[in-house]
Amino acid sequence: YDFTNCDFEKIKAAYLSTISKDLITYMSGTKSTEFNNTVSCSNRPHCLTEIQSLTFNPTAGCASLAKEMFAMKTKAALAIWCPGYSETQINATQAMKKRRKRKVTTNKCLEQVSQLQGLWRRFNRPLLKQQ
C-alpha cells in the first residue's frame, strides 16, 4: 500500500490521543535504554510503511502484536485516514484469523514495540524544512 495520500495530521492526532498510551502500557516496566533502535524511516509515508510492517507482520519471536490494543487502533486510524487502505487489508486479515495464537509478551515483542515507538516519534515530528 502507498501511504502518500493519507491524512498525516489526523493519524498523528490519533496516535497522540490514544495509540501512544497503549504503547506505553505495553512497554510498562521496560527501561527506555533496554533496546537499540535499528529501524528508521525517512519521511511520513515511509514511516507508515515501516509502522505497518512492524505492527502487523509476524516476525521470528514475535507473532502476536496484531491483536494488541495499539495495533487495532493503528489499523483503525489507517483505515479511516488512508484512502483505500481497508480494501488492501481484507486478505491479510483473513489470513491472520486462521493463525491466531495465544498472546505472549516476549522480549522480542518488547524490542519490536520499542522500535515502533521510535518510528511513531519520527512520523509525528519530521523536520519539514530540509536544508
Partner: antibody, heavy 120, light 111 residues
Framework: EVQLVQSGAEVKKPGSSVKVSCKAS????????MHWVRQAPGQGLEWMGA????????SYNQKFKDRVTLTVDKSTSTAYMELSSLRSEDTAVYYC?????????????WGQGTTVTVSS | DIVMTQSPDSLAVSLGERATINCRAS??????????MHWYQQKPGQPPKLLIY???NLGSGVPDRFSGSGSGTDFTLTISSLQAEDVAVYYC?????????FGQGTKLEIK
C-alpha cells in the same frame, strides 16, 4: 540516566566562530530530534534549529540559517552547533534540548547551557 | 512566523493565591483537534522545565496545582495556590509551525 552535557563557556571575538557540543547519554540518540535554543542575558528563549541524528536532516530558524550549522556524531552521541560571523548580540546561553519520547514536540531534557560571550 | 504574546510581563501574587498567565498566538496553533502549545518554567541559572504539554496535559512530576487550558490562539496557565518555589519565569511555546516560537516570558513573584 537520560542527560545532555554541554561543553564549557567560550569567549570569542566579533567575526569569529564558536562550536558548542552536546553529549547525549541514557537514550537512543539517533531517534530523537535534537534542538538548539539560545537565551541572551535577561531575555527570553529563541529557537535556532533542530537536527535528526538518524539521517542528519536539519530545520533552521531562517534568522540564523546563513550563520548556524547543526551536525551530529552518532558514534559519540554528540550534537554540535556552530555559529559563525559572531557579533556582540550573539552573547547568550546556548542550550541543546531533546524532544520528548512520544512526538508531542516538547523539550523534555535540556543541557546545562553553554555561555558564549562575544567581546572585542 | 507565529508570534506568541504573553500577558502580563510580570505578576506578583500572594502565597496561596491563584496566579494566571495568558498567551496569545498570532495564528492558530491547533491541528486536527489538538493544540500544539506547551508551557515551561525557568528558574535563575537553570534550563527551562516542561510544565504543560499540548495546552492542558500535565508534564511528568509536575504538581497538580499547575493547569493549562485554551485552544486556537488563546491559552492560559494557572497556578491554583502559589508556593514559594513557583517564583520563576514562565514561557509558552508553539510547535505547530516552523520556526518554533516562544512567548517573551512572564516573571512571577511573591507579593
Amino acid at each position: 540516566e537520560v542527560q545532555l552535557v554541554q561543553s564549557g563557556a567560550e569567549v570569542k571575538k566579533p567575526g569569529s566562530s564558536v562550536k558548542v557540543s552536546c553529549k547525549a547519554s541514557g537514550f537512543t540518540f539517533s531517534t530523537y530530534n535534537m534542538h538548539w535554543v539560545r537565551q541572551a542575558p535577561g531575555q527570553g528563549l529563541e529557537w535556532m534549529g533542530a537536527i535528526y541524528p538518524g539521517n542528519g536532516e536539519t530545520s533552521y530558524n531562517q534568522k540564523f540559517k546563513d550563520r548556524v550549522t547543526l551536525t551530529v556524531d552518532k558514534s559519540t552521541s554528540t550534537a554540535y552547533m556552530e555559529l559563525s560571523s559572531l557579533r556582540s548580540e550573539d552573547t547568550a546561553v546556548y542550550y541543546c534540548a531533546r524532544e520528548d519520547d512520544y512526538g508531542e514536540g516538547y523539550f523534555d531534557v535540556w543541557g546545562q547551557g553553554t555561555t558564549v560571550t562575544v567581546s572585542s | 512566523d507565529i508570534v506568541m504574546t504573553q500577558s502580563p510581563d510580570s505578576l506578583a501574587v500572594s502565597l496561596g493565591e491563584r496566579a494566571t498567565i495568558n498567551c496569545r498566538a498570532s495564528e492558530s496553533v491547533d491541528n486536527s483537534g489538538l493544540s500544539f502549545m506547551h508551557w515551561y518554567q525557568q528558574k535563575p541559572g537553570q534550563p527551562p522545565k516542561l510544565l504543560i504539554y499540548r495546552a492542558s496535559n500535565l508534564g511528568s512530576g509536575v504538581p497538580d496545582r499547575f493547569s493549562g487550558s485554551g485552544s486556537g490562539t488563546d491559552f492560559t496557565l494557572t497556578i491554583s495556590s502559589l508556593q514559594a518555589e513557583d517564583v520563576a519565569v514562565y514561557y509558552c511555546q508553539q510547535i505547530n509551525t516552523d520556526p518554533l516560537t516562544f512567548g517573551q516570558g512572564t516573571k512571577l513573584e511573591i507579593k
